[in-house]
């Protein structure tokens, strides 16, 4: 019995005065608690408790189930205990078959003994199967057998408590160990689509998939910057032990513009959290936005190729696309394709391939696209750069020499005089009149320039050169002059094309 200093409250004393007591089944259990401030007896076994307010605990005919710890407590909260074994050869174990183990923790197989004097108290596998090699346990006759550091691999392990009694092995009823996995990683979360674009009134539905080792993973859909509870529907599956999957589906049956925003699927377990987001954009009606990939004013040299390229965003998806020139629709020479194969793609590319363009093929090329909500178009102004062509070169009745040239960009006409037989016409002559004439062709056609000089200025035999040039090239025409006495004659003009 414990001893305390005088004046201090002391724990109760129990008779018989020993820590353990062994009685046979059918015998009497008589325990006396002596204390001036006696409060109660408490009996505990296998997580069950009973109380008795009498200071003498009497069980007339002891049964194996009376095995356990008897504790007497006084009004000061001080207590004393005795453990009673009720030896019953027919019931060597008291059993609570509930057996849960948390991964990496110890767990107790509750099979306390009714007879502490049996030997070889241990665990055995069911049907003679061996226990896992790494399974370690510590027996305690009053509590059961403690399995140390439970492994996930022990899940659904079938066990018996075992003792040797009179040379024979006796097994308890079976236990099935149910291991609860420890969370050793954050949940794995994924979303059906990263972004959604809808028209007002359409249904928004997005599914988050959460994977973890146990169904006790927590998950929820949240709207960023909002505390509003979202309506979710769940499906879940166990793909074998420790492989749990949940699908949380968020639905807005008729989306509105103000539903636009970022939605987060959040999951957490005791290890940590993970999240994934999806973006919803709700528009009041569909749209098409066209982006030219080249300048909409295009200059191209005669005979060369050019590709007119546009990218466009279309929602809902485009239904009709066409390229038009001079009110004619191209049936070939163009292609239209989505920018990506992603199912949420709304960006497309259209390309018109113009090959070996002629000077007469300049003009406005228009791309038109439409969907169920809107139409859109973009125009390209194509200018074909052509080398000047001298259309006319004449001596007029008034003595003027006139040269008319056409090309794009607008040609410049220069005049030169070459005295005598010299081939090099270096002396420049200033024109009397220069005019840009309105072409009768399309607005993107060649530009016509007329330039005139006064032939009376020439006093010697020689050649007059009219040279028309632009960024693309140059062309010349020549007037030959010969004087017979005082008369000036124009000998046949001729042209030299200088590329």
């Amino acid at each position: 019995q414990p001893s305390v200093s005088p004046g201090e409250p002391s724990p109760p004393s129990i008779h018989p005065g020993k820590s353990d007591l062994i009685v046979r089944v059918g015998d009497e259990i008589r325990l006396l608690c002596t204390d001036p401030g006696f409060v109660k007896w408490t009996f505990e076994i296998l997580d069950e408790t009973n109380e008795n307010k009498q200071n003498e605990w009497i069980t007339e005919k002891a049964e194996a189930t009376n095995t356990g710890k008897y504790t007497c407590t006084n009004k000061h909260g001080l207590s004393n205990s005795i453990y009673v074994f009720v030896r019953d050869p027919a019931k060597l174990f008291l059993v609570d078959r509930s057996l849960y183990g948390k991964e990496d923790n110890d767990t107790l197989v509750r099979c306390p003994l009714t007879d502490p004097e049996v030997t070889n108290y241990s665990l055995k596998g069911c049907q003679g199967k061996p226990l896992p090699k790494d399974l370690r346990f510590i027996p305690d006759p009053k509590a059961g057998i403690m399995i140390k550091s439970v492994k996930r691999a022990y899940h659904r392990l079938c066990l018996h408590c075992s003792v040797d009694q009179e040379g024979k092995s006796v097994l308890s009823e079976k236990f099935i160990l149910k291991v609860r996995p420890a969370f050793k990683a954050v949940p794995v979360v994924s979303v059906s689509k990263a972004s959604y674009l809808l028209r007002e009134g359409e249904e928004f539905t997005v599914t988050c998939t959460i994977k973890d080792v146990s169904s006790s993973v927590y998950s929820t859909w949240k709207r960023e910057n909002s505390q509003t509870k979202l309506q979710e529907k769940y499906n879940s599956w166990h793909h074998g032990d420790f492989n749990y999957e949940r699908q949380a589906t968020l639905t807005i049956s008729s989306a509105r513009v103000n539903d636009s925003g970022v939605f987060m699927c959040y999951a957490n377990n005791t290890f940590g959290s993970a999240n994934v987001t999806t973006t919803l954009e709700v528009v009041d009606k569909g749209f098409i936005n066209i982006f030219p990939m080249i300048n909409t004013t295009v200059f191209v040299n005669d005979g060369e190729n050019v590709d007119l390229i546009v990218e466009y965003e279309a929602f809902p998806k485009p239904e009709h696309q066409q390229w038009i020139y001079m009110n004619r629709t191209f049936t070939d020479k163009w292609e239209d394709y989505p920018k990506s194969e992603n199912e949420s793609n709304i960006r497309y590319v259209s390309e018109l391939h113009l090959t070996r363009l002629k000077g007469t093929e300049g003009g406005t090329y228009t791309f038109l696209v439409s969907n169920s909500d809107v139409n859109a178009a973009i125009a390209f102004n194509v200018y074909v750069n052509t080398k000047p062509e001298i259309l006319t070169y004449d001596r007029l009745v008034n003595g003027m020499l006139q040269c008319v040239a056409a090309g794009f960009p607008e040609p410049t006409i220069d005049w030169y005089f070459c005295p005598g037989t010299e081939q090099r016409c270096s002396a420049s002559v200033l024109p009397v009149d220069v005019q840009t004439l309105n072409s009768s062709g399309p607005p993107f056609g060649k530009l016509v320039v007329q330039s005139s000089i006064d032939s009376s200025a020439f006093k010697h035999n020689g050649t007059v050169e009219c040279k028309a040039y632009n960024d693309v090239g140059k062309t010349s025409a020549y007037f030959n002059f010969a004087f017979k006495g005082n008369n000036k004659e124009q000998i046949h003009p001729h042209t030299l094309f200088t590329p």
Epitope: D47, E48, T49, N50, D96, S98, Y100, K102, L108, R110, I176, K178, R180, S214, S215, S216, S236, H238, D241, Y244, N269, T270
Partner: antibody, heavy 118, light 107 residues
Framework: QVQLVQSGAEVKKPGSSVKVSCKAS????????ISWVRQAPGQGLEWMGV????????GYAQKFQGRVTITADESTSTAYMELSSLRSEDTAVYYC???????????WGQGTLVTVSS | DIQMTQSPSSLSASVGDRVTITCRAS??????LAWYQQKPGKAPKLLIY???SLQSGVPSRFSGSGSGTDFTLTISSLQPEDFATYYC?????????FGQGTKVEIK
């Protein structure tokens, strides 16, 4: 023998929440799982979820995910089940039971009738 | 989730009759199956666990058998106190499901 004693009957309005308690007496609480099972009038049994009081990490049936919250207070050996956004079809007897993590239910509470009515 | 289908949904029998109730799982659940008895206004009572183990205090006229997907509860000789509704329950994974119940009535 361990007994589970539940709180009394409740009448609730649609859209509100109810919290039912379940106290273990005659034994300890922490070595077991505690589950909640409900039974609508004239209907079968429906498992709602489970908790290990020693850890507090609950698991829920997919039908109730997001609407039920199961908690436990080890110090008082009491488990709680809160069901939110109540509707008339939640009218049922709600039972707590010992077990439910890959196990049967060997001890049951007496049941708590929750009536949802406007 | 694993679905449990119980049959029949109800049966009429007399005292002394042998009664058999079956339960089928939508996938294999090994022997993770329990049977319960429920009387009107009372909580269910565990009869059989692990498909065939008799719960302490339950009369031996109750027995269970089966493994995998097909299970049977047998009452060898029906007693007056056995008229009740019987439920099967699977607990192979964390998510538990019950059969829809079989009501045993007096013929």
């Amino acid at each position: 023998q361990v007994q589970l004693v539940q709180s009394g009957a409740e009448v609730k309005k649609p859209g509100s929440s109810v919290k039912v308690s379940c106290k273990a007496s005659g034994g300890t609480f922490s070595s077991y799982a505690i589950s909640w099972v409900r039974q609508a009038p004239g209907q079968g049994l429906e498992w709602m979820g489970v908790i290990f009081p020693a850890e507090g990490a609950p698991g829920y049936a997919q039908k109730f995910q997001g609407r039920v919250t199961i908690t436990a207070d080890e110090s008082t050996s009491t488990a709680y089940m809160e069901l939110s956004s109540l509707r008339s079809e939640d009218t049922a007897v709600y039972y707590c039971a010992r077990g439910g993590y890959i196990s049967d239910f060997d001890v049951w509470g007496q049941g708590t009738l929750v009536t949802v009515s406007s | 989730d694993i679905q449990m289908t119980q049959s029949p949904s109800s049966l009429s029998a007399s005292v002394g009759d042998r009664v058999t109730i079956t339960c089928r799982a939508s996938q294999s659940i090994s022997n993770y199956l329990a049977w319960y008895q429920q009387k009107p206004g009372k909580a269910p009572k565990l009869l059989i666990y692990d498909a065939s183990s008799l719960q302490s205090g339950v009369p031996s006229r109750f027995s269970g058998s089966g493994s995998g997907t097909d299970f049977t509860l047998t009452i060898s000789s029906l007693q007056p106190e056995d008229f009740a509704t019987y439920y099967c329950q699977q607990y192979y994974y964390e998510s538990i499901t019950f059969g829809q119940g079989t009501k045993v009535e007096i013929k």
